[in-house]
């Protein structure tokens, strides 16, 4: 019998300074590119080695980005979200949601569409 898997969801404000090669991460999601079923949110899909996000260390693959410089990312087309990041300036404030898998019982199983990495 599988153990139950719960998720600890936390939010964090992350302030990044744009580096020589930018912020250094990739995103998926948007109203036209849903990555998680019934969720058009924006998720971090890649942290680039030695980029600003990697050097800061707080942003993780699988994190959901809720806002950029106070601007909500709800109900945005994918490319509009990309453009928002690209035009966000030198100092970028990200409100992010971390989702940490917490296993209860002997065996854990990640549900379909779970973005956590």
């Amino acid at each position: 019998m599988n153990g139950r898997v719960d998720y600890l969801v936390t939010e964090e404000e992350i302030n990044l300074t744009r580096g020589p090669s930018g912020l250094g991460f990739n995103i998926v999601g948007g109203t036209d590119q849903q990555y998680v079923s019934n969720d058009s949110g924006i998720y971090v899909s890649r942290i680039k080695e030695n980029g600003a996000a990697a050097l800061d260390g707080r942003l993780q693959e699988g994190d959901k980005i809720l806002s950029v410089n106070g601007q909500d990312l709800k109900n945005l087309l994918h490319q509009d979200a990309v453009d928002l990041f690209r035009n966000a300036g030198y100092a970028v404030s990200l409100r992010v949601q971390h989702r940490l898998q917490v296993q209860n019982g002997p065996i854990g199983h990640r549900g379909e569409g779970d973005p956590s990495g």
Epitope: S21, G22, L23, G24, F25, N26, I27, V28, Y35, Y43, V44, S45, R46, I47, K48, E49, E61, G62, H78, Q79, V82, F85, R86, R110, G113, D114, P115, S116, G117
Partner: nanobody, 128 residues
Framework: HVQLVESGGGLVQAGGSLRLSCAAS????????MGWFRQRPGKERDVVAT????????YYLDSVKGRFTISRDNAKNTVFLQMNSLKPEDTAVYYC??????????????????????WGQGTQVTVS
């Protein structure tokens, strides 16, 4: 982190076929760009074929176009490389590679087009 395990390599005669498989674990497969690279004896590692996270964009090395096909099965967390009409010059260690897909939030450049973050141990393909 992502763990990648290749299989399907072996010894085959020229003109024959092999199908390489790469099983991925450690994070949701559906968000990963996947690639196959090869390292021939005495040469540097070269990209052979890539497929993006949505499966709608592929790339092939010129010398394998029309002979090799990359595909993915998200339900099985696996990427495949079907290799037909194999030639002795295809002899190499073949490596599976992965990286997070999606769009860079930075301006896109060709620099880094074939930069991958996670690598398998490789599987030997020998064409005699």
């Amino acid at each position: 982190h992502v763990q990648l395990v290749e299989s399907g390599g072996g010894l085959v005669q020229a003109g024959g076929s092999l199908r390489l498989s790469c099983a991925a674990s450690g994070r949701p497969f559906s968000s990963l760009d996947m690639g196959w690279f090869r390292q021939r004896p005495g040469k540097e590692r070269d990209v052979v074929a890539t497929i993006n996270w949505t499966g709608d964009s592929t790339y092939y090395l010129d010398s394998v176009k029309g002979r090799f096909t990359i595909s993915r099965d998200n339900a099985k967390n696996t990427v495949f490389l079907q290799m037909n009409s194999l030639k002795p010059e295809d002899t190499a260690v073949y490596y599976c590679a992965a990286r997070g897909g999606g769009s860079s939030v930075d301006s896109e450049y060709d620099v880094g087009k074939f930069e991958y973050d996670y690598w398998g141990q490789g599987t030997q393909v020998t064409v005699s």
